[in-house]
Interface confidence: medium
């Protein structure tokens, strides 16, 4: 079948990193600087991702292989293949629609992207705050209050926390 | 398989318009929110609008605001912004989006597709 199939389509043998050239009577042609072709029995070579601005290179552009980006510092990849750079926030925030935001009251975030989580709730477990939580840091919950001695005190419970997702006006 | 395939990117003149349109296929449109965010060169991604499932429902970021205008075609399964006045720092790559919901959310999490993006340039 290979054979019948390069008998009738001569494009068929040119391997991946080459096109078949139609203005040279269908000879296997390198691709031209600047361009890949990934699969063999192409046409024409594609052209090569470029890498600029905010987007820096991660892999370069080879005759059979796309090039792959990354983002600079600061930012981080979104999207199929890197193809947006979304900005990092600081700890204790969280990136919406319309910038780095302080996380909410009850709510932490220990990253530079992502959102901002409720604390975990002590009492759920029968613990006691023993640390208080932070924008930055989640609570830690220390014994059950019947553990501790005499005289202790436990630290309130932090209040639930907001529902994400709220539409940006 | 869900696809958002933008088109309608260019070179414009300073001051001129552009419509941007986004095909949607692979599930069922008028259910989810759709938005629009760009990347220019130099900076990070920056939301520019949304519209709810329906379309009654419409939201800009501040730098376009009173410019751009978002709109859809159930019957299509297009998304389009409408880009009028517009300025050097509007040159981007436009991405097209769609959300989990019907409603828009604070947060690109709430984003489960993105397209491939079209280039806008805008010349003086």
């Known amino acids: 079948f290979e054979r019948t199939r390069s008998l009738q389509d001569p494009c068929s043998n040119c391997p991946a990193g080459t096109f078949c050239d139609n203005n040279r009577n269908q000879i296997c042609s390198p691709c031209p600087p600047n361009s890949f072709s990934s699969a063999g029995g192409q046409r024409t070579c594609d052209i090569c991702r470029q890498c600029k601005g905010v987007f820096r290179t991660r892999k370069e552009c080879s005759s059979t292989s796309n090039a792959e980006c990354d983002c600079t510092p600061g930012f981080h990849c979104l999207g199929a293949g890197c193809s947006m750079c979304e900005q990092d926030c600081k700890q204790g925030q969280e990136l919406t629609k319309k910038g780095c935001k302080d996380c909410c009251f009850g709510t932490f975030n220990d990253q530079k992207r992502g959102i901002c989580r409720p604390w975990t709730n002590c009492s759920l477990d029968g613990k006691s705050v023993l640390v208080n939580g932070t924008k930055e840091r989640d609570v830690v919950c220390g014994p059950s209050p019947a553990d501790l001695s005499p005289g202790a005190s436990s630290v309130t419970p932090p209040a639930p926390a907001r529902e994400p997702g709220h539409s940006p006006q | 398989e869900v696809q958002l395939l933008e088109s309608g990117g260019g070179l414009v003149q300073l001051g001129g318009s552009l419509r941007l349109s986004c095909a949607a296929s692979g599930f069922t449109f008028s259910r989810y929110a759709m938005t629009w965010v760009r990347q220019a060169p130099e900076k990070g991604l920056e939301w520019v609008s949304s519209i709810s499932g329906s379309g009654d429902d419409t939201y800009y970021g501040d730098s376009v605001k009173g410019r751009f205008t978002i709109s859809r075609d159930n019957s299509q399964n297009t998304v389009y912004l409408q880009m009028n006045s517009l300025r050097a720092e509007d040159t981007a790559v436009y991405f097209c989006?769609?959300?989990?919901?019907?409603?828009?959310?604070?947060?690109?999490?709430?984003?489960?597709?993105w397209g491939q993006g079209t280039t806008v340039t805008v010349s003086s």
């Open positions: 989006a769609k959300e989990k919901a019907g409603t828009t959310g604070d947060y690109y999490y709430n984003v489960d597709v």
